[in-house]
């Protein structure tokens, strides 16, 4: 899978993670901290 | 599936006020950005503002600073664009147009006619 | 902000004509590059995003290409249906429009 750091307006898009561009799959994607979860890293689970 | 469903065309008087609403269904807003883009008769496209319901933070293009407020209802899964002091050059079409995890997804845009 | 001038404001060209549109940032925007096509009275839409990659159902006539400030949108087999104005749009940093090619038949 071809990934690459996403566009620079999407910072602050993940709450607790770091975005991540897909390309093969055309998608923007939270990589989340432990702990962290939800489509932004937006939700603590522990 | 997803939808992003505007409020219907207004015509409006100059020095007026317009609020258009976009509500969204089949996914969260919070997990997106807002854009709105406007697009005056024969004339390009032209990126207004965007808001990002979750964190409720906006940029707006500096030519619309100050005329423009964008803002998100999270319960209501909506949002809205208010453009205030409005003058002939303001009659478009004006589009929202949601971004975030999947590339943009447009409305079906609203028609905002300024006329004395 | 970052600005788009995109070229020619209008072009003319036969049917089976390979046609070029061009994109140019005023700063590196790393490939965030898309491409829209509008008819008249229609929403536009979307044909190319992250310069190359093309939209399901859109025919593979449609091409992009290029990096750093640099981009261009590909038609390699004009079709009457092709005839519609096409903007490029950078979101790298926020979002700008070039301001549109209208493409016309011969």
């Known amino acids: 899978v071809s990934i690459t750091k996403c566009n620079s307006d999407m910072n602050g898009y993940c709450l607790h993670g770091q975005c991540i561009y897909l390309v093969d799959m055309s998608q923007n994607y939270c990589r989340c901290e432990v702990g962290y979860t939800g489509v932004r890293c937006e939700h603590f689970y522990l | 599936q997803d939808q992003l469903v505007q409020s219907g065309a207004e015509v409006k008087k100059p020095g007026a006020s317009v609020k258009v609403s976009c509500k969204a269904s089949?996914?969260?807003?919070?997990?997106?950005?807002i854009q709105w883009v406007r697009q005056a008769p024969g004339q390009g496209l032209e990126w207004m503002g965007r808001?990002?319901?979750?964190?409720?933070?906006?940029k707006y293009r500096e030519k619309f600073e100050g005329r423009v407020t964008i803002t998100a209802d999270t319960s209501t899964n909506t949002a809205y664009m208010e453009l205030s002091s409005l003058r002939s050059e303001d009659t478009a079409v004006y589009y929202c147009?949601?971004?975030?995890?999947?590339?943009?997804?447009w409305g079906q845009g609203t028609l905002v006619t300024v006329s004395s | 902000d970052i600005q788009m001038t995109q070229s020619p404001s209008s072009l003319s060209a036969s049917v089976g004509d390979r046609v070029t549109i061009t994109c140019r940032a005023s700063?590196?925007?790393?490939?965030?590059i898309a491409w829209y096509q509008q008819k008249p009275g229609q929403a536009p839409r979307l044909l190319i995003q992250?310069?190359?990659t093309l939209q399901p159902g859109v025919p593979s006539r449609f091409s992009g290409s290029g990096s750093g400030t640099d981009y261009t949108f590909t038609i390699s087999s004009l079709q009457p249906e092709d005839i519609a104005t096409y903007y490029c749009?950078?979101?790298?940093?926020?979002?700008?429009f070039g301001g549109g090619t209208k493409v016309e038949i011969k």
């Open positions: 147009v949601r971004s975030g995890r999947e590339f943009d997804y």
């Open positions: 089949g996914f969260n807003i919070k997990d997106t950005y």
């Open positions: 808001i990002d319901p979750l964190r409720r933070q906006t």
């Open positions: 700063q590196d925007i790393h490939k965030y």
């Open positions: 992250y310069t190359s």
């Open positions: 749009l950078q979101y790298e940093q926020l979002r700008t």
